[in-house]
């Protein structure tokens, strides 16, 4: 499945927004930092072909979107920003799903894919009790918002490189 | 199949040092988290600690840290939960147990092990 | 910590009877309710999780509801087998906590 020349423009658009959305310095929350444990060798671009990779990139979108399109998250962030960033989201979820559908069946290696699917889930879900623990405040969200940055960045290089290899 | 296979019972004096065992296989150990549950005699359950074998990323019970400790081998995909003064009030069952993960992120306890009784007496 | 409260903490039944037990949170966890039984002298067997949705292998005749603080277990036609004790967990908070249990006898 190839996915559309816009799937690529919305991903580095989304990536702008979360920049954009930012509403304090870093710096003030360092007490906040948390490593989330972002399983980068599970959505590394080097060791998953494309067929694994369509869902793995589908499942992150999703829990980013889970993340902010949350009422706690509206409360948090500049409403247009927040609206353009999850709208972008869609789009590429809706890409990536419409890449799953012409792929059912053609799993190469379930478990793999089974276990880089979990992966990605324990890594938002830590995020999410993060949250709660933290009760939403606006440094959690700031802590959050960049290390979904770092989850994003990831998802566009493994496009990036899905696009060359066809 | 999923197995979650733990070590015999054990007796030991108050004092002393214990580690327990839990075997699983059947599934990509890295894949899902592990936690340890207590069950005193006659009593209810009482979750102990979590584990995620990818990383060894663990969540304590207040009620349990520092007395108690996880760890995980991934050569052997075998996870420890170790004492090292056991006093007569850890007398119970401990089970180990697989959570699954949902897409909507609730996590639930999926498959047990068989428990192992731990008695400690003077 | 979040208190599960399971009522009644024992309840007598015969054969064939429909039982309902009940467990409420002390603040909201959402779905995260879970149901386990435990026949004597074996370990917990998971048969609800997130509130409705039964365990793969659990018989139909076991169902849960609800959501927010309140949860319920409603096991119809019963079966030998389900004399036992249920228990209701959540997994919204830490430390997880599990309901104290409701043991179910023959009448």
């Known amino acids: 499945c190839d996915l559309p020349q816009t799937h690529n423009l919305r991903n580095k658009r989304a990536l702008t927004l979360l920049v954009q959305m930012r509403r304090l310095s870093p710096l003030s929350c360092l007490k906040d930092r948390k490593d989330f444990g972002f399983p980068q060798e599970k959505v590394d671009a080097q060791q998953i072909k494309k067929a694994q990779a369509i869902p793995v990139l589908s499942e992150l979108t999703q829990q980013i979107l889970n993340i902010f399109t949350s009422k706690d998250s509206s409360a948090a962030w500049n409403t247009t920003l927040l609206d353009s960033f999850c709208n972008d989201l869609h789009q590429q979820l809706n890409d990536l799903q419409g890449c799953l559908m012409q792929q059912v069946g053609v799993q190469e290696f379930p478990l793999t894919q089974e276990d880089a699917l979990l992966a990605v889930r324990k890594y938002f879900h830590r995020i999410t009790v993060y949250l709660r623990e933290k009760k939403h405040s606006p440094c959690a969200w700031e802590v959050v918002r960049a290390e979904v940055w770092r989850a994003l960045s990831s998802s566009a290089n493994v496009l990036g490189r899905l696009r060359e290899e066809k | 199949e999923v197995q979650l296979v733990q070590a015999g019972a054990e007796v030991k004096a108050p004092g002393e040092s214990l580690r327990i065992s839990c075997k699983v296989s059947?599934?990509?150990?890295?894949?899902?988290?592990i936690s340890w549950v207590r069950q005193i005699p006659g009593k209810g359950l009482e979750w102990m600690v979590k584990?995620?074998?990818?990383?060894?990323?663990?969540i304590y019970n207040p009620s349990f840290q520092g007395h108690v400790s996880i760890s995980v081998d991934k050569s052997i995909t075998t996870v420890y939960l170790q004492w090292s003064s056991l006093q007569a009030s850890d007398t119970a069952i401990y089970y180990c147990v697989r959570h699954y993960l949902t897409q909507s992120l609730v996590d639930y306890f999926d498959h047990w092990g068989q428990g192992t009784l731990v008695a400690v007496s003077s | 910590d979040i208190q599960m409260t399971q009522s009644p903490s024992s309840l007598s039944a015969s054969v064939g009877d429909s039982v309902t037990i009940t467990c409420r949170a002390s603040q909201s966890v959402s779905n995260y309710f879970h149901w386990y039984r435990q026949k004597p002298g074996k370990a917990p067997e998971l048969l609800i999780y997130s509130a409705s949705n039964l365990q793969t292998g659990v018989p139909s005749r076991f169902t849960g509801s609800g959501s927010g603080t309140e949860c319920t277990l409603t096991i119809t036609s019963l079966q030998p087998d389900d004399f036992a004790t249920y228990y209701c967990?959540?997994?919204?908070?830490?430390?997880?906590?599990f309901g104290q249990g409701t043991k179910l006898d023959v009448r």
């Open positions: 059947g599934y990509t150990f890295t894949s899902y988290w």
């Open positions: 967990q959540q997994t919204h908070g830490y430390p997880f906590t």
């Open positions: 584990i995620d074998p990818r990383d060894s990323y663990t």
